[in-house]
């Protein structure tokens, strides 16, 4: 019996910060959870991790040197991730795992998110000489 | 209180099996995995692998890979390792730790250890 | 694998002095290294967690500081208690590792 998630499928992002929101088949309200994010089509990289219950302030944090922080409501987590470059453009995938009340329950595999950062250009605008 | 009682010392036979246990009790035992730890006499400590008892998955020091299994079992709160073709460098104390499973970096409650000595 | 090298391997010290233990990560571990006290005989204990945190109990003598790959362990006005040996544990990815250890004795 597995949860469902909903990602966008496609974040463009123009600055360097980006929210990507998890939205899930099932109630976050008074249970103990671990929602985390992560990079790449075979999910090597575990970029950011929300631990809550609803009871205490969620902690969030990365191990991987991600600037990450998350919103938590009933059914959504949004992770919020700046300083992000062009070479963070890859597929993002959401994950939700239930520690507490047993059984243990998770999701299935989302179809996940690309996010696309896109390269800044600096425009030098030309003024033409004075006379 | 917060608990994690292992099981008393082993003298086993080279060559063959031994399975130690570690019991949880006064927590919820899903929301923490179980980790291994080594320690040969006067010598450091040794990280073996861990299991989370939600979803039973493993991680292991590659080391260990053929060594150590980790097996849990939910209905008594207790994690079990099995030590397989056992030499004398397997004699030590193993201890049994926790780390939270949504937080997960350090060791905060220990079992007081089991002895395993190897010896014909 | 991550390697943790820890220095001194052993040091002794006089009762109210302040001693510092390091410890070195072979790569980027951020602040993902914790801190214990093992007495002789006894288990290991959790001291200061990701880096810089006092767990619980822990008398404020002890301090942690560093990110990166470069982290200490301070102990000041030394008390006979705090004869023991002390690891550090990089928490940032499987495997986790262990520094050697450093023992500490008083003069």
């Known amino acids: 019996n597995k949860i469902l998630v909903k990602q966008s499928p496609l974040l463009v992002v123009d600055s360097n910060e980006v929210s990507l929101s998890c939205r899930y088949s099932y109630n976050l309200l008074a249970k103990e959870f671990r929602a985390s994010l992560y990079k790449g089509v075979n999910s090597d990289v575990e970029v950011c991790v929300g631990n809550g219950n609803f009871t205490y302030q969620p902690q969030v944090y990365s191990k991987t040197g991600f600037n990450c922080d998350g919103d938590f409501d009933n059914e959504t987590v949004t992770f919020r991730l700046w300083n992000l470059h062009v070479n963070h453009t890859d597929i993002y995938f959401c994950k939700i795992e239930f520690m507490y009340p047993p059984p243990y329950l998770d999701n299935e595999r989302s179809n996940g998110t690309i996010i696309h950062i896109k390269e800044k250009h600096l425009c030098h605008t030309q003024s033409s000489p004075k006379l | 209180q917060v608990q994690l009682q292992q099981s008393g010392p082993e003298l086993v036979k080279p060559g063959t099996s031994v399975r130690i246990s570690c019991e949880a009790s006064?927590?919820?035992?899903?929301?923490?995995?179980i980790h291994w730890v080594k320690q040969r006499p006067g010598q450091g400590l040794e990280w073996i692998g861990c299991?989370?008892?939600?979803?039973?998955?493993?991680n292991y020091n590659e080391k260990f890979k053929d060594k150590a299994t980790l097996i849990v079992d939910t209905s008594s709160n207790t994690a079990y390792m099995q030590l397989s073709r056992m030499t004398s460098e397997d004699s030590a104390v193993y201890f049994c730790?926790?780390?939270?499973?949504?937080?997960?970096?350090?060791?905060?409650?220990w079992g007081a250890g089991t002895t395993v000595t190897v010896s014909s | 694998d991550i390697q943790m090298n820890q220095s001194p391997s052993s040091l002794s010290a006089s009762l109210g002095d302040t001693i510092t233990i390091t410890c070195h990560a072979s790569?980027?571990?951020?602040?993902?290294l914790n801190w214990y006290q093992q007495k002789p005989g006894n288990i290991p204990k959790l001291l200061i967690y990701k880096a810089s945190n006092l767990h619980t109990g822990v008398p404020s003598r002890f301090s942690g500081s560093g990110s990166g790959t470069g982290f200490t362990l301070t102990i000041s006005s030394l008390q006979p208690e705090d004869i023991a040996t002390y690891y550090c544990?990089?928490?940032?990815?499987?495997?986790?590792?262990f520094g050697g250890g450093t023992k500490l004795e008083i003069k």
């Open positions: 299991i989370y008892p939600g979803n039973v998955n493993t």
């Open positions: 730790t926790r780390s939270h499973y949504g937080l997960d970096w350090n060791f905060d409650v």
């Open positions: 544990q990089q928490g940032q990815t499987y495997p986790y590792t």
């Open positions: 006064g927590y919820t035992f899903t929301s923490y995995y």
């Open positions: 790569q980027n571990i951020y602040v993902w």
